[in-house]
Structures are given as C-alpha cells and as structure tokens.
C-alpha cells in the first residue's frame, strides 16, 4: 500500500508563438482545478479507459480574473498535493493523464460550469520510495510543469511497496521465520496481520488491516453468508437478520455520466467511461477541434476546423498516439553500452557514461591507467572505469605517495608495544596479556579469556598470536 503524489508547479502559456487566450475574463472569472488518472503498466489504453490505479481531484484554485490587454500569465494554482492512494503493489510502470479544468464562476443557471482546458498524458517508469521526478508536458499552447513520486505507507517498504517491515525488538536478530528487511538493517519483515476478527475460514487479506471475503460471504469480518435466493439487489449494507444484501445508495445511482457514458464505482467515488469523442469527469466535453488544442507534447494539429470534421495530430519525435499523448520509450532498447545511463530528452537520446567510457553510446573504453603513475613502485590496476594503485609494502594512498605507518592507529591494546614489520605490524604484549593485538587477558590459573584457541595452541600457552 502507498500513495502516488503529484505536485503541480505551474500551468500557463508554453514557449513559442501563438500564446493562448486567458481562460478567464472580467465578465467570467474562473478558477482552475486538476484531475489525475493513473493506470498500471505502459498501457496503450484509450483516455476513456478506467483509472485502475486510482484518480484524484485537486482543490479549487484561487479565483482569477483576466487583466484586460495582458497576456495570459501562469495561472493561480490550488494548494497542496494531489494524492492517489494505491492499496496493492506499486506497479513500477504506469500511465497518467493530468487534466486541467476551468470552473467558470459567472452567473450560470444551475451553478458553476466546468470545461476542460488541457489534458496531458504520458507513460513512465517509477520506483516507489525514490525522489521526486520532475516533468514538463505541453497540451496545445499550454504548458504544465509538475513533479511526482510514489511512496509506501508503513509498514510497507521496497520499490513496489510489497514488503512489510517493522522495527526490530531485539538488537541481534529477527523472530522465527522473519527475515531482516534489507536495506533497512534495523528492521524485520512483519507477519501480515488482517483486520482484527477477520474470519480465518471465510476471510483473507493481502494488505495489513484489511478483510476480504471469499465468494459467498460478506460483512466487515466475512462472517455473514450471502443468501442470493431471497435478496433483491447485490449491493448495499448487509442485513444481520437474513444475511442478505439490501440495496443502498451508490455513487452511480441515476448515472451521472452524460452522453452515453457508463458509470463504474470506485472506492472513493465513481468513474465515467466515455464514448469516443466525449471526455471529462462526466463525459460532458465534446466536439473537439484543433482550436481546443487536442495535440499534446507539441504535436501539430491539422484539419478539424469544425466539430464534425476529424483532426490529425502530427507528433514530434519521441511521441505517438492519436493525440501525441504517448511518449516513445526509446531507452527500452538499451542503446547505451557499458552500463551507461539512458536519457530520453524527447528531441534526442543522450547517454550518460560511467567513468572510463565515452562516445555517443558509451562505446569507447578509455585507458584508465593512461598517464596515471603510481609512486614508490606501485602498479596501476585498470578496471570498472577507474584506476587504482596496488602499492608496494610500506606505502599507501591513492597514488602510493603516502608512507604507511601500521602503528599510527595504536593497534596494540593494554599497553602493548607496536613494531612496524615488513609484513605489517607486531604487538609485544605487556605481562598478563596475549593475542595478535594483546586483546586477551591471561588468567592467573593459566586459562585465558579466549573464546576458542586456534588449532595446535592451548589457551594457556604464553605465546603471542602473530
């Protein structure tokens, strides 16, 4: 379980000619809000398909009124993040749609009017727990700047939020059958605990605290049998007397989706699946023409002068789809050699090479040791894009320029004296101590505090370990 978070930084006119008209006017003040829709995988799904990973609406932004004669500036934004909770594992690859909506606050009959200003879409790879990723998307003449990340909700951890961890109770090891939770060395995997009282026979869970029912059972703890014979409707709170499900009001009652859209319930609200040619929260946006800026990511719109004629988007390099909403993932072909990092800049591919490699695709292996000398008889060792010196005895440091003094760290305990030796160091122990570093006291009865003596040496032998 976890949360996808989206931070909108700015929404305003994009660079280049053809600045868009301000969406608000003195006669029609308005305010913006945003909607994000997430789908798992690098799907080729249409914009109308359900937001299987979840969706969220932002708060309304501040009211904005256009200043006459002024170009459209970056528009005032709603406060806070858009948060999309996900209950299951984070898929790692996902598709998103971010819609910018305008709420007109004039004297509309029946309340404010909503209209879709811009929609951007894309497909991305993202590991949970990573840093904020920044993005810029263009929809017609508009530009949206935003950041996003996915984070796990405790006790879930990992790049997919599938591992459960809890702090260790004992400093040394985890409980029976529980593994340490790498890379969090001070945490252990937690056993999965369902909602308290969840039926062990008819319920199950895959996330902490939940209780999902096997077929034929219902209720918060899966203790109520579903009796279909005398039930009228398959939805609603359970009736404790009959075990039936009695109908209750649902978000899709009365079908809030316009223009033939079909409604499906989501955990928090509803989702409209719109027929082709209609968009929006309730399928209320239709008749898209080139004037509406339907081509994303700098796509060129051709035709579509009136709502009855089709438009075609000519996509810039790196984008595809009927609205240029899909980014071509050219890095999936792994064009960068020798472990180089691939960057798809949209207009071009760039490879960021590891140290020791160069070239447009990191194909050239540089000689790491070229022009690099190791002092004092050291030899240069090439490897992994970096050079290192293997130093002669008595020398150390990156280039073997430092004289190594093995006794500098005072390695001999309990007053033992250190002597530099061609093979390293030797400790001459004070009376009553023994060991390679004089760390073990010799007991008066002849037994030492050694945990176990090396083969061939009794614990009481007054010899030094070298």
């Amino acid at each position: 379980a976890g949360v996808f978070e989206l931070q909108i930084h700015s929404f305003g006119p994009g660079p280049g000619p053809g600045a868009p008209r301000s969406p608000c006017s003195a006669r029609l003040p308005c305010r913006l809000f945003f909607r994000v829709c997430l789908k798992p995988g690098l799907s080729e799904e249409a914009a109308e398909s359900p937001c299987a990973l979840g969706a969220a609406l932002s708060a309304r932004g501040p009211v904005y009124t256009e200043q006459p004669g002024a170009p459209a500036p970056d528009l005032p934004l709603p406060d806070g993040l858009l948060q999309v909770p996900f209950r299951d594992a984070w898929p790692g690859t996902f598709s998103f749609i971010i819609e910018t909506w305008r709420e007109e606050l004039g004297d509309q009959i029946g309340g404010p009017a909503w209209s879709l200003l811009a929609r951007v879409a894309g497909r991305r790879r993202l590991a949970a727990g990573g840093p904020w990723a920044r993005d810029i998307q263009r929809a017609g003449a508009w530009e949206l700047r935003f950041s996003y990340r996915a984070r796990c909700e405790p006790p879930a951890v990992g790049t997919a939020c599938t591992r459960l961890c809890r702090p260790r109770s004992a400093p040394s090891r985890c409980g029976p059958g529980l593994r340490p939770c790498a890379p969090l060395e001070d945490e252990c995997e937690a056993p999965l605990v369902c909602r308290a009282g969840c039926s062990p026979e008819h319920g199950f869970c895959e996330q902490p605290g939940e209780c999902r029912c096997l077929e034929g059972w219902t209720g918060p703890l899966c203790t109520v049998p579903v009796s279909t014979s005398s039930c009228l409707s398959p939805r609603g709170p359970s009736s404790a007397t009959t075990g039936c499900l009695v109908p209750g009001p649902g978000p899709c009652d009365g079908n809030p989706c316009a223009n033939g859209g079909s409604c499906s319930e989501t955990p928090r609200s509803f989702e409209c699946t719109c027929p082709r040619g209609f968009y929006g929260l309730r399928c209320e946006v239709s008749g898209v023409t080139c004037a509406d800026g339907p081509c994303f990511n700098g796509g060129l719109c051709v035709g579509g002068a009136d709502p009855d004629s089709a438009y075609i988007c000519h996509c810039p390099p790196g984008f595809q789809g009927s609205n240029c909403e899909k980014r071509v993932d050219r890095c999936s072909l792994q064009p960068c050699r020798n472990g180089g990092l691939c960057l798809d800049l949209g207009h071009a591919l760039r490879c960021r090479c590891r140290a020791g490699f160069a070239g447009p695709r990191c194909e050239h292996d540089l000689d790491d040791c070229a022009g690099r000398a190791c002092a004092n008889g050291g030899t240069c060792v090439e490897g992994g894009g970096a050079h290192r010196c293997s130093c002669a005895l008595g020398f150390g440091g990156r280039d073997c320029r430092e004289r190594a003094d093995p006794c500098a760290a005072r390695p001999c305990a309990h007053g033992g004296r250190c002597y530099a030796h061609f093979s390293g160091l030797v400790c001459a122990c004070a009376p009553g101590y023994m060991g390679a570093r004089c760390e073990f006291p010799v007991h008066p009865d002849g037994a030492s505090a050694l945990p176990a003596a090396p083969p061939g040496l009794r614990p009481g032998d007054p010899q030094r370990y070298l």
Partner: nanobody
Amino acid sequence: EVQLVESGGGLVQPGGSLRLSCAASTYTISSGYMGWFRQAPGKEREGVAAIYIGGSTTLYADSVKGRFTISRDNSKNTLYLQMNSLRAEDTAVYYCAAQLRPNSAYHPLDGRKYNYWGQGTLVTVSS
C-alpha cells in the same frame, strides 16, 4: 515439528484418475487450512485446492473445478486429492501444505498462507 508426507503419484493416461494422500505426522491438525499445490517444469507453483479443517469451506483453482475433489479424514489425520479426467497439463509435482495456526492472512490458494510443506509427489499424465 509437523511432517507432511505425500503419496499416490504416478503415471496415468489422459482421462484417467489418481488419488493423492497427505499424512500429517506428530501433530493432529484440528483447524486451519490445508491445501494442494502443484509445480510443472519451468512454471511457477500454483494453488490447486484448499480445505478448512474444522469447517466446511473448500476452494478450487478454475483449471481443476469439477474434476478434482479435496477431502480430509480426521480420524487418520490425512488429506486427500481425488483427481479425475486427468489431462496432460495436470503433469506436475504435487505438494501438500498446512497452516497450523489459523489466521486470515492471504488467500487459501496463495502459497504464502502455509508454513508447513511436504516433499511432493510426481504426477505424470501421458499416453
């Protein structure tokens, strides 16, 4: 420590039947789920059937519904899997699994639910 020992595997022709047994030694399993799992060469382990000891619930994977039956003889502390109308795709090593402390974590056909496993018995369906 519970030991689960499977038996009854072997070679059978398509359309034939086999009955697998799983004997639990040193411990009488009185509640919790027991299940049968299988793993074909080069494939992931999959849940086949599960039964709740001390209750009435039985569950089957879609691929075996109507052909396989899971049952339990409490007096013998033994789990059974009756396999009829066997197909070539049923060829696999079949494992018996037990959950000794009943709890609701994970679906009964999910291997993560079980903390004791047998060594497996090979079922080969071939003409």
